[in-house]
């Protein structure tokens, strides 16, 4: 999915005011918040590319993710200012639910969130050359 | 009036630990965006950005030096710590605390006067 | 982590000349068409003083005289007409990628 077109202004809007709080939450209570930057993004629509492939596909221990508050209000706010984005997800979305898994925190999906963390922290950068 | 201050021991022996504490007002730690970042001067050297503490308990670290440093924060009562392992003689320096800002929300800077640390036999 | 690399170490300039320092990052510090880079000047027993934001705007209160380009991994800071009280050490920083870092550093001595 090509992120170019979503509104940025009100993803960044939701992500201020639910997700942050989502992804902080998910994080209390561990120390394990030391990790590298591992992943980066050079724009906006960078950002969310990333931000999706970390947020919704599985990976090398951690399977969990999509299922998260955090992932559930990420979806809704890409679906609903980014146009089309609905329609690529429908497929994602039914083999997910074939491949349920018990919800388990590992270290992996700490550092994963803790990625997620500063990609959006990235995404919502105010620009200058815009202001 | 946005205000850092650092504090220190002054002086202390190799192999201890370093504790530092930064006690700012004028903004909190809590607030979307901010964070504490330390930054050292070593004698005759250039600045050293060592660890940054974010809103979101989000860490970061000198690779050099990231095995010996311990960050942390008591928002609730505006400090940010910093402690550094097995010192030596190469960790003397002035030590500065400032505030950090995601991206450019405001076009300020602000740092303590910072604290001299002395690592001697 | 971000490297930078400062050049010349040191400088001397005449009094109303031209400074220049050069600032090279290991990697691009660009993001959505902002430049993360920042130039500070210090001096002996004093905190950095933020001089340029954002690899080319100045701040409030900095004098004109003091100016800074570049985008990407290449960035400068101008000092014209240089004065006496510019004598101090000059740092560039990035502060697009955690953990944010600090140029080597550029002493400039006026004569």
């Known amino acids: 999915y090509d992120f170019t077109n979503c509104d940025f202004e009100k993803i960044k809007a939701a992500y201020l005011s639910t997700i942050s709080k989502d992804l902080i939450t998910y994080m209390s209570g561990t120390k394990s918040t030391e990790f590298n930057n591992t992943v980066s993004c050079s724009n906006r629509p960078h950002c969310l590319t990333e931000i999706q492939s970390l947020t919704f596909n599985p990976t090398a221990g951690c399977a969990s993710l999509a299922k998260e508050m955090f992932a559930m209000k990420t979806k809704a706010a890409l679906a609903i200012w980014c146009p089309g984005y609905s329609e690529t997800q429908i497929n994602a979305t039914q083999a997910m639910k074939k491949r349920r898994k018990r919800k388990v925190t590992t270290n992996k999906c700490l550092e994963q969130v803790s990625q997620l963390q500063g990609l959006w922290r990235r995404f919502n950068r105010p620009l200058l050359k815009q202001q | 009036q946005v205000t850092l201050k650092e504090s220190g021991p002054g002086i202390l022996q190799p192999s201890q630990t370093l504790s530092l504490t930064c006690s700012f007002s004028?903004?909190?730690?809590?607030?979307?965006?901010?964070?504490i970042g330390w930054i050292r001067l070593p004698s005759g050297k250039g600045l050293e950005w060592l660890a940054s503490i974010w809103w979101d308990d989000n860490r970061y670290f000198n690779a050099a030096l990231k095995s010996r440093l311990t960050i942390s924060k008591d928002a609730s009562k505006n400090q940010v710590f910093l402690k550094i392992a097995s010192v030596d003689t190469a960790d003397t320096a002035t030590y500065y605390c400032?505030?950090?800002?995601?991206?450019?929300?405001?076009?300020?800077?602000?740092w303590g006067q910072g604290t001299l640390v002395t690592v001697s036999a | 982590d971000i490297v930078l690399t400062q050049s010349p170490a040191s400088l001397a300039v005449s009094l109303g000349q031209r400074a220049t320092i050069s600032c090279k990052a290991s990697q691009s510090v660009d993001f959505d068409g902002d430049s993360y880079m920042n130039w500070f000047q210090q001096k002996p027993g004093q905190p950095p003083k933020l001089l340029i934001y954002a690899a080319s705007n100045l701040v409030s209160g900095i004098p004109a005289r003091f100016s800074g380009s570049g985008s990407g991994t290449d960035f400068t800071l101008n000092i014209h007409p240089v004065e006496e009280e510019d004598a101090a050490t000059y740092y560039c920083?990035?502060?697009?990628?955690?953990?944010?870092?600090f140029g080597g550093g550029t002493k400039l001595e006026i004569e």
């Open positions: 004028g903004f909190s730690l809590s607030t979307y965006g901010m964070g």
């Open positions: 400032a505030r950090i800002e995601d991206g450019y929300y405001s076009y300020h800077s602000y």
């Open positions: 920083q990035q502060i697009d990628e955690d953990p944010y870092t």
